[in-house]
Amino acid sequence: DTHKSEVAHRFKDLGEEHFKGLVLVAFSQYLQQCPFEEHVKLVNEVTEFAKTCVADESAENCDKSLHTLFGDKLCTVATLRETYGEMADCCAKQEPERNECFLQHKDDNPNLPPLVRPEVDVMCTAFHDNEATFLKKYLYEVARRHPYFYAPELLFFAARYKAAFAECCQAADKAACLLPKLDELRDEGKASSAKQRLKCASLQKFGDRAFKAWAVARLSQKFPKAEFAEVSKLVTDLTKVHTECCHGDLLECADDRADLAKYMCENQDSISSKLKECCDKPLLEKSHCLAEVENDEMPADLPSLAADYVESKDVCKNYAEAKDVFLGMFLYEYARRHPDYSVMLLLRLAKAYEATLEKCCAAADPHECYAKVFDEFQPLVEEPQNLVKQNCELFEQLGEYKFQNALLVRYTKKVPQVSTPTLVEVSRNLGKVGAKCCKLPEAKRMPCAEDYLSVVLNRLCVLHEKTPVSEKVTKCCTESLVNRRPCFSALELDEAYVPKAFNAETFTFHADMCTLSEKEKQVKKQTALVELVKHKPKATKEQLKGVMDNFAAFVEKCCKADDKEACFAEEGPKFVAASQAALA
């Protein structure tokens, strides 16, 4: 449906509060280095303009596209060239190229200081003094650090952030009330950002067919009682929502997401019995709830798939008539029967089936050729099952920190060219799969583990794309979205890698080590571990364990000493010498 003024249409649909929040998020995700005040000024100007268009849709410039309006506004920033360099060249382009140019300059790893959490009283004072500015600051700080954060979901996080302060700043023990809530929001926010980043990578690098396949599999697991036509409609709508958000069209995205939530709640009976409690909630909470809803129960007595997908003489005819519909139905039927499989496994199975049909439907006797297609599925199913079993056993044996260290060693040996901070970040997150998934019942382990690993490995791919250093990483990241995890799992020690020269400075530590939090201490030790492996890629587990144990003992000893700095200065070189000897 066309509107005379797109900006007026979105302002009216979304309301002023959400409109302003989304415009702030959009601008902060594009211009990640701009100061807060600059963004607030731009947002206020856009909002005032939108109000004039609401009053009179035929007023000057009201007929312009949102990209044109927002792009023009971004290009008024005076310091664009100094702050962003070549991104300023985007402003010389016309739409739609200008928006594409802005999108390409989004930085997944912006050079921004880590967010420091002030004292609780300081935060509560700021919250009470100017609640609106306090919440805008939250949107701005999260959005600029996470340029692909799912914007309507970020509004939901901001609402929870507000609720936490409103409740806890009145509490007797403000800190005890507030800090766990902020920790939870931080951790959930990071997870939400990473999940959305995979959706955007899927759309941008592999196209909407890849995203639609992912969505068919996931929604069929969630809504196994829904008909294929219903799942297909939801997939089409969801693809539009995510395409818009990943493309920076945040107003359209939020509006369409609200429409999708409305549709789902109006059609619960043909979708899922689990939607009821979501549908009574206010909009932001409702959309979040629907996205996270648990899988509905599978219908009883679903027939074997062999009749329609192997035994039927019409398989090739049905496939040829509408390939994507036929494969979509295959994926739907398989996924609704297997909530115990990861989405990535289901997509591999569909891919294997597609490859078999491509080969067999051109053969002399197609039926004979594809008659045993499902025998090819068994190894595909058993590989992630075994991987989850082995890694959960290792996690239970080692605990999280040592499990992360095992993964750090494993991945550094596979791709030693990758920067140490990236290897530490990615391996630490890979290691979190244990605590997240291994405690779950067996039926939930594989979908939890493999789909989480896909999200973490996407972070490696995104960071590596910015600064490519390893052909093996490029290959695993670009060849096949669904085979990324198996591709990385299959990598062995890189024999071509020339070990990094030893640098004593890398292994020099100071008394400031003692004041670090437990997490920061772990990161320091894990950074040293990666550097050790880069120096001696063929070091054995036992050798590395010995060095790391000595390292922990050395740090503990010096942190107990009266003159800590003197201890580090004296014991440090001894530790380095002993480590070199142990790894020789």
């Epitope: 679903l302 115990d340 499902f374």
Partner: nanobody, 116 residues
Amino acid sequence: QVQLVESGGGLVQPGGSLRLSCAASGSTWSINTLAWYRQAPGKQRDLVARISSGGSTHYADSVKGRFTVSRDNAENTLVLQMNSLKPEDTAVYYCYAQSTWYPPSWGQGTQVTVSS
């Protein structure tokens, strides 16, 4: 195909407990739903309890709160823990496997008799 073998049946007094096991072999990778059915003399075969691939369970009203179904995918076994048994629970108990790629499979059955 999937092959199923039940064990654990026997004679038990009212109020007692029994634990039935079903060992699956063959193409177990393709199983989605496992279930226990029972057939009393002269009656039709009825569902007792079902557990899906996602772990969700469903029980016949007559056994709710007394019977518990569980599955161990690693060991390929289905278990039915039966407590507070009643004479009307007397029947032949059959293990059932629904497969994604193969026809459904039934075990041979194991007799459960509840009598004082």
